[in-house]
């Protein structure tokens, strides 16, 4: 605790103190006050700079004295060998004594008490701003008049804050403008305008003299303006060193005005103003602002429309424009909405065919798609080159968005087909030479593949069995080749209206219009062992002339069994129609002239013995075509005969290439549209 | 009408091995793919592995590889079959069957040769 | 291998009744399934092709049914001749794999 005064006595005092004994002391008296401390008697042992006995007084970090030897009073009248006088409420004594003394000492005696200290003009640094006034145990401030002590109760200022301006125009001044503003204030003003205007300072350079910076160029005296994040200054110095003109992008302004103690200038004035808070003209790429304008400010609105191939995306829906309003805090509304370029995405698939994966599928992008060649081509032209377009679609110079249709191509065996041994008559043959070749299991029989969906045979093998199997890509009809080829199943039979269909269809001698299509339940894919023969055209070019070569295969009757295991096929002549006249029916069931012969009918055959026979029904007859000689087409199909190893009738296919066409867009699904 | 006409029945120890022979008449064997089937007395029937023209390969039921070796001789029309290592257990009538068209899975039989394996 | 498993493996029934044997396969064998006959000391003779195929001089009361994994054989009406051990067969895929046999005796 704290004492008004108090007495140190070394130990044993006032017998010898004992050696190698270190004490101190801790006095302490009263804030406020001073500490004044004295010695009435002093014999410790002499040494230089009290090396070996000493007492020590302390003040803070600073050594007031070191005491050692013996001391007398000079004044007569008073018992004080030695004392000390400090301005704080604090101070420690320390007494040491070596480890040996060569005469007896008896030590010292001293006194300590407080005392006042003037803090008004004990001191280096004045402790009140203007009036100090001490007194016994402390001191206090006072002020001017219109001055007012701060919080701090040491420093007077002038009141000068507190002022806020909400009107949208104003003039604010330093206090006692153009007379000297106080010293060591701190003045705010604050502007507070309606949300969407913003504070605009004006100043003229005359109208500001803020006492000049330091020399490391630090504002002694200094005006600041803070807009929310934003600081403009701080200022000083004779003559407005600012922008004579602030615009603040707020509409809350603080204007700060700190003054020091000294050097005391004329100040400032200043005017203001709300502006509509102004929106910058953005860059916003790829876009163009409707309408168009220098300066935009609060509560402008603008159309931002995307320029062609771009968008607005906006979760997962796109707008080619959106509109933006400049906002209050003077920041447009949507900022964040951009006009990126269109993405048409991954581009669709085509059956039968390929498009390769895009590098980017933004707008401008291109891409090609190809179709599985040489087995499918693209129907629809266009060349398959795709760009991404404004709308967001893959577009073609041809076909618009239309998707590239492949389609198969017709009438390109893989192989051609070459005759060998003679075997009726006709030759071992691969189903990469007659890809189109369909078999019929029940009955044994064939067809001719004419596209994806549609197999064309006779009438004849079809009319029994409106469900019957089919086979494509094998060249064998052994069981084990079947189980490995495609088996297509049908969805509907047509024969065509003008066959006759009989109750007892063995004793048939009229074998007019035998012809019809069976439509397949999917799609037949196409590669080297299975692809459609090509349809006649309707031009004289595809009417048939005798001696005219065309090609039959199939798995039916040969010399040595009664159906062939591997695919045969013979190269034979058309031949004029009364060859097949002449010929004796082998087996006949009726009369021989009551078999039909009609200008739907071809005759071929007749040479070498090469024919077709029981169990080729159906099959093709494949005539190159005049106007593209890669290609084969089915001029006929394997209807009846006379005798095999003669000639052959044959249904003229041209003759119903108008119906085959109706028949099957009549019967098409959407996909195939 | 096609017809086979297996070699006769055989006696053999265990660990030796067998060849049965099938001569095709009414058809030539490069027409044809023969099968073989076997059947144990009292049991069922067991298929052994055929050779396939198309791909010009014997193909062996997973059981018999190794042990069994099919051949054909074009000039004769004659097939054979040799199965080797002979156990007990193989004893059982040996059928050459020719395989069928349009689904039919086989359309002419040999009339059986029946090997007996005994000590 | 794909496995072929027929039940019953022994039936017993008069003449007149209809009968019928299951066949099961381990995968999916499409139609690729046929039917035999097999009579002591002969060679088995075919019956159905193709699941449900009548070979030709088969009678009529043999039929079949069923594809992928199912498969029936249904005899209308039982006659004396008919008393045999019947066989399914697969022929989808090598191997090709038999049943073990139904053996229909008189009851």
């Known amino acids: 605790e704290p004492t008004m005064y108090g007495e140190i006595l070394s130990p044993n005092y006032p017998q010898a103190y004992p050696s190698e004994v270190e004490k101190s002391w801790d006095i302490e008296v009263p804030e406020g006050y001073g500490i004044h401390l004295y010695f009435t008697h002093l014999d410790i042992e002499l040494s230089e700079n009290c090396a070996y006995d000493s007492v020590q007084i302390i003040s803070g970090d600073t050594e007031e004295g070191r005491l050692c030897g013996q001391r007398s009073s000079n004044n007569p009248h008073s018992p004080i060998v030695e004392e000390f006088q400090v301005p704080y409420n604090k101070l420690q004594v320390i007494f040491k004594s070596d480890f040996s003394n060569e005469e007896r000492f008896t030590g010292f005696a001293a006194y300590y008490v407080a005392t006042d200290i003037n803090e008004c003009t004990d001191f280096v640094d004045v402790p009140c701003s203007h009036f100090c006034n001490n007194f016994i145990g402390g001191y206090f401030c006072s002020c001017p008049p219109e001055y007012f002590l701060h919080d701090d109760m040491k420093n007077c200022g002038v009141n000068c804050s507190g002022d806020v301006f909400t009107a949208l125009i104003g003039e604010i001044a330093s206090p006692n403008y153009p007379k000297p503003y106080p010293e060591n204030s701190r003045c705010e003003y604050q502007i507070r305008l309606e949300k969407g205007f913003q504070v605009v300072v004006t100043l003229r350079r005359e109208d500001f003299d803020v006492e000049a910076a330091d020399s490391a160029g630090n504002c002694l005296d200094s005006l600041v303006f803070v807009a929310g994040d934003r600081q403009f200054g701080p200022y000083c110095g004779h003559g407005f060193p600012g922008p004579l003109n602030i615009e603040t992008k707020s509409n809350a302004l603080d204007i700060i005005f700190q003054t020091d103690l000294t050097g005391q200038k004329k100040g400032w004035k200043l005017r203001y103003h709300g502006d509509p808070m102004p929106c910058p003209k953005e860059d916003t790429p790829n876009s163009v602002w409707e309408p168009a304008k220098a300066k935009y400010v609060f509560r402008d609105v603008v159309q931002i429309t995307c320029l062609d191939g771009f968008e607005v995306v906006e979760g997962r829906v796109g707008a080619t424009s959106f509109y933006s309003t400049c906002q209050s805090n003077g920041k447009w509304s949507n900022s964040k909405l951009k006009c990126q370029p269109v993405d048409c995405g991954i581009p669709e698939s085509i059956e039968n065919g390929k498009v390769e994966d895009p590098e980017s599928t933004l707008f401008g992008s291109v891409i090609r798609y190809t179709c599985e060649e040489p087995y499918y081509y693209m129907e629809n032209g266009g060349g398959g080159e795709y760009h991404c377009a404004g709308n967001g679609s893959w577009v073609n110079e041809v076909l618009g968005p239309e998707l590239p249709k492949c389609v198969p191509v017709c009438g390109v065996p893989r192989e051609p087909f070459e005759e060998k041994q003679r075997i009726i008559g006709g030759s071992d043959a691969d189903i990469k030479n007659f890809p189109w070749q369909v078999f019929f299991d029940n009955p044994w029989a064939g067809g001719a593949l004419i596209n994806e969906y549609w197999v064309l045979t006779a009438a004849h093998v079809v009319e029994g069995n409106r469900e019957p199997t089919m086979y494509v890509g094998s060249t064998s009809v052994q069981t084990s080749r079947l189980a490995k080829s495609k088996m297509l199943t049908p969805e509907h039979v047509f024969i065509h209206p003008g066959w006759k269909l009989l109750e007892v269809p063995e004793g048939r001698t009229n074998f007019d219009n035998d012809i019809a299509l069976v439509r397949l339940k999917d799609p037949v894919k196409m590669g080297p062992t299975v692809s459609p023969i090509c349809l006649p055209g309707t031009s004289s070019d595809y009417n048939l002339m005798d001696g005219d070569l065309g090609l039959i295969s199939g798995w039916g009757r040969t010399e040595k069994r009664d159906r062939a295991v591997r695919l045969k096929a013979a190269r034979l002549p058309v031949a004029p129609l009364r060859k097949c006249k002449e010929v004796k029916v082998e087996k006949p069931t009726a009369d021989a002239e009551a078999y039909v012969f009609t200008p739907n009918m071809i005759c071929a055959g007749g040479e070498k013995g090469m024919d077709s026979c029981k169990g080729d029904s159906g099959g093709a007859f494949a005539v190159q075509d005049p106007n593209d000689k890669t290609k084969f087409y089915a001029a006929g199909l394997v209807s009846w005969g006379p005798q095999c190893g003669t000639y052959g009738l044959y249904t003229r296919v041209k003759n119903y290439v108008d119906w085959i066409m109706k028949t099957m867009q009549e019967n098409s699904t959407p996909r195939e549209d | 009408e096609v017809q086979l006409v297996q070699s006769g029945a055989e006696v053999k120890k265990p660990g030796a091995s067998v060849k049965v022979s099938c001569k095709v008449s009414?058809?030539?064997?490069?027409?044809?793919?023969m099968h073989w089937v076997r059947q144990a007395p009292g049991k069922g029937l067991e298929w052994m592995g055929t050779?396939?023209?198309?791909?010009?390969?014997?193909i062996y039921a997973q059981k018999f590889q190794g042990r069994v070796t099919m051949t054909e001789d074009t000039s004769t029309d004659t097939a054979y079959m040799e199965l080797s290592s002979l156990r007990s257990e193989d004893t059982a009538v040996y059928y050459c069957?020719?395989?069928?068209?349009?689904?039919?899975?086989?359309?002419?039989w040999g009339q059986g040769t029946l090997v007996t394996v005994s000590s | 291998d794909i496995q072929m498993t027929q039940s019953p493996s022994t039936l017993s029934a008069s003449v007149g009744d209809r009968v019928t044997i299951t066949c099961r396969a381990s995968?999916?064998?499409?139609?690729?399934l046929a039917w035999y006959q097999q009579k002591p000391g002969k060679a088995p003779k075919l019956l159905i092709y193709?699941?449900?195929s009548l070979e030709s001089g088969v009678p009529s009361r043999f039929s079949g049914s069923g594809s992928g994994t199912e498969f029936t054989l249904t005899i209308s009406s039982l006659q004396p001749d008919d008393f045999a051990t019947y066989y399914c067969?697969?022929?989808?895929?090598?191997?090709?794999?038999f049943g073990q046999g139904t053996k229909v005796e008189i009851k």
């Open positions: 069957v020719t395989e069928g068209l349009g689904g039919r899975p086989f359309d002419h």
């Open positions: 009414g058809d030539t064997l490069t027409e044809l793919s």
């Open positions: 050779f396939d023209p198309e791909e010009g390969e014997t």
């Open positions: 995968q999916s064998i499409s139609s690729w």
């Open positions: 193709k699941a449900s």
């Open positions: 067969q697969q022929v989808n895929s090598y191997d090709w794999t």
